[in-house]
């Protein structure tokens, strides 16, 4: 599997809603015995590796899992809506988090993590990451703008 990010930078004015997306590309046949654990978290650009430090998004830790044969099934979890968040996963491999009514404090590096679990053992940890910049003031745009990554930045980070 591979995790890609369609956009690497989102620039939003305060008060807008923004949907950050990772795409899980799964080339293995649907019958393969593997599950995925998935989460979103805030991180920082570490000296060695991005997405290594984990911080909850708006004090919320998301938990999702699905099986290759039932890709759209999510684990139940503490209602993200209470935190102004929506987390979604569709049959096309899009794993997204929507932040409602963004504020300056939502700015930061957002990471999606996908853990491939085979026969109960975590095989691989794959990350995608993107920056959210929330802007204030009269000079900022009225809607969010998303910028695609450079070619060399578009692939996921893999940690065995």
């Amino acid at each position: 599997i591979k995790v890609t990010t369609p956009y690497s930078l989102y620039v939003c004015p305060e008060g807008q809603n923004v949907t950050l997306t990772c795409r899980i590309l799964d080339s293995v046949s649907k019958g393969h015995d593997a599950n995925f654990l998935k989460t979103w978290f805030l991180s920082s650009r570490g000296e060695v590796q991005v997405c290594k430090e984990h911080r909850p998004i708006r004090n919320f830790i998301s938990h999702h899992q699905h099986h290759r044969s039932h890709p759209a099934v999510n684990a139940s979890h503490d209602q993200p809506q209470k935190h102004g968040l929506e987390i979604a996963y569709d049959n096309h491999g899009n794993f997204s988090i929507t932040l409602h009514n963004v504020t300056l404090s939502d700015s930061g590096l957002y990471c999606c993590l996908v853990i491939e679990v085979k026969h109960h053992h975590p095989e691989r940890r794959l990350y995608g990451y993107m920056e959210l910049q929330v802007q204030t003031g009269k000079g900022s745009a009225s809607t969010c703008t998303a910028y695609p990554p450079n070619e060399q930045d578009s692939d996921s980070i893999t940690a065995a």
Partner: antibody, heavy 119, light 107 residues
């Protein structure tokens, strides 16, 4: 093979500070993971005290935050717990444990050390 | 904080029987982890992320559930399964919380 071993005094006087150290072998505490302190009492069961991450940031149980300090000595591959103003209610078996950031479970534990608070 | 309530507090069964241990959360959680603790030993990870067996755990142990209700099942009990079993959550953090434990006797 990763091993964690707690050490420190088994008896602490009321109002004093409890100090324990966890020595980690087989893995560098600066490489990854969160490094946790957990205590166990017959009355309250297992209680998470707090942790220090591989990068040195800390998080504490809100119920103990005002009395707890977790620090580390990277040169010795150790992390430590200090709990101030102890009372008899702090008598417990204290364990250190390692947890990966996600999916957040304790995969390696120390054997635990019993601390009694008594004059 | 999220409170985890385990039931029953104690359970006494015979070898070969099926054990069902419950862990109920005070509000919805993502994953529950299960640990086994024998007298004088540290807790041992049993099930992580609700349903995945930790390294070296036999297939007779299984976990299931979601939201507020989670279950640890031991399909065919062995005498060595006598222990205290704890559930744990890390969805609401801090603090990480544990259940009060279920003491299982196999005799």
């Amino acid at each position: 093979q990763v091993q964690l071993q707690e050490s420190g005094p088994g008896l602490v006087k009321p109002s004093d500070t409890l100090s324990l150290t966890c020595t980690v072998s087989g893995y560098s505490i600066t490489s990854d993971y969160t490094w946790n302190w957990i205590r166990q009492t017959p009355g309250k069961g297992l209680e998470w005290i707090g942790h220090i991450t591989y990068s040195g940031s800390v998080s504490y149980n809100p119920s103990l935050r005002s009395r707890v300090t977790i620090s580390r000595d990277t040169s010795k591959n150790q992390f430590s717990l200090k709990l101030s103003s102890v009372t008899a209610a702090d008598t417990a078996t204290y364990s250190c444990a390692r947890a990966l950031y996600y999916p957040w479970y304790f995969d390696v534990w120390g054997t635990g050390t019993t601390v009694t608070v008594s004059s | 904080e999220i409170v985890l309530t385990q039931s029953p507090a104690t359970l006494s069964l015979s070898p070969g029987e099926r054990a069902t241990l419950s862990c109920r959360a005070s509000s919805s959680v993502g994953y529950i982890h299960w640990y086994q603790q024998k007298p004088g030993q540290a807790p041992r990870p049993l099930i992580y992320a609700t349903s995945y067996r930790a390294t070296g755990i036999p297939a007779r142990f299984s976990g299931s559930g979601s939201g507020t209700d989670n279950t640890l099942t031991i399909s065919s009990l062995e005498p060595e399964d006598s222990a205290v079993y704890y559930c744990q959550q890390w969805s609401s953090y801090p603090p990480i919380t544990f259940g009060g434990g279920t003491k299982l006797e196999v005799k």
